[in-house]
């Protein structure tokens, strides 16, 4: 049986300060049931970058429409990039749990590097 795969096609992305960074992620299946989230870094100290269901992420927009049915594209764009945004970003699929969702599978990560703003 084909298990869901989390595909982050770019190992690295380089963006000039002040520009937007697009981080690509796709799933191969709609199951198991559960949400998708983006994080910067790995492990217990990782930073939540985007969760559609709850939270406020003013610099993050989704590449696909949030009302799109049966969406498999979970790419995001982060605006107004600064050097503080550098790091490795992970697209993570969660499996619905009770009471808490459980991490199911992570993408391989995309390293974001920030170039100095051209003068």
């Amino acid at each position: 049986e084909d298990e869901l795969q989390v595909i982050q096609p770019e190992k690295s992305v380089s963006v000039a300060a002040g520009e937007s960074a697009t981080l690509r992620c796709a799933m191969t299946s709609l199951i198991p049931v559960g949400p998708i989230m983006w994080f910067r870094g790995a492990g217990a100290g990782r930073e939540l970058i985007y969760n559609q269901k709850e939270g406020h992420f003013p610099r993050v927009t989704t590449v696909s429409e949030l009302t799109k049915r049966n969406n498999l594209d979970f790419s995001i764009s982060i605006s107004n990039i600064t050097p503080a945004d550098a790091g490795t970003y992970y697209c993570v699929k969660f499996r619905k749990g009770s009471p808490d969702d459980v991490e199911f599978k992570s993408g391989a990560g995309t390293e974001l590097s920030v170039r100095a703003k051209p003068s």
Partner: antibody, heavy 120, light 108 residues
């Protein structure tokens, strides 16, 4: 065209078992969650169970008695119903789940249903 | 468990009239509401999802609105084929998925 065809309903006595099947066609069955929703005679809709890959979810009223499963090689969804009670009497609908956004499921296609009657 | 309350329970309407159905959630469900139509002896049919998005092939006389706890389904001009029972469903917090009790639309 998406098609969902339920079978296996019938009349049973309280405490007996029944297995419902739902044959699916017209879509990539293996990548979608699937559900069972029931409707007692003259009543509203009640969600029964959902299956993703091997992740399963049940209404409290059927937990421990009903088991949902799927066979992706046969494009078929199942509901094994044990220890049936009079209050399980209903039309059982098979439904295809649809997601919107990054999470959240509703039911975009339904079968015609199969009637289960539990009576002594 | 999130409880959905639909009102009124029954509506008597003439063809051509504008019809409004209400669905109220016991807690915030964001925009995670779907609406279904069910005719006697038939399976439910999806009309609206994400509170306001029409399903494929649904006529534009059907529209949905609302967010949070209060939702509305409107039929701008009721046609004879629109009679039946209408249900709302929440998918914000589950299990369980929950449905409203339904609103029955009868011919006046």
């Amino acid at each position: 065209d998406v098609q969902l065809v339920e079978s296996g309903g019938g009349v049973v006595r309280p405490g007996e078992s029944l297995r419902l099947s739902c044959a699916a066609s017209g879509f990539s069955f293996s990548i979608y969650a699937m559900s069972w929703v029931r409707q007692a005679p003259g009543e509203g809709l009640e969600w029964v169970s959902t299956i993703g890959a091997d992740d399963t979810y049940y209404a409290d009223s059927v937990k421990g008695r009903f088991t949902i499963s799927r066979d992706n090689s046969k494009n078929t969804l199942y509901l094994q119903m044990n220890s049936l009670r009079a209050e399980d009497t209903a039309v059982y609908y098979c439904a295809k789940d649809s997601t919107v956004g990054w999470s959240g499921d509703f039911f975009d296609y339904w079968g015609l249903g199969t009637l289960v009657t539990v009576s002594s | 468990e999130i409880v959905l309350t639909q009102s009124p329970a029954t509506l008597s309407v003439s063809p051509g009239e504008r019809v409004t159905f209400s669905c109220r959630a016991s807690q915030n469900v964001r925009s995670d509401i779907a609406w279904y139509q069910q005719k006697p002896g038939q399976a439910p049919r999806l009309l609206i999802y994400a509170a306001s998005s029409r399903d494929t092939g649904i006529p534009d006389r059907f529209s949905g609105s609302g967010s949070g706890t209060d939702f509305t389904l409107t039929i701008s001009s009721l046609q004879s084929e629109d009679f039946g029972v209408y249900y709302c469903q929440q998918y914000y917090d589950w299990p369980p998925f929950t449905f409203g009790g339904g609103t029955k639309v009868e011919i006046k």
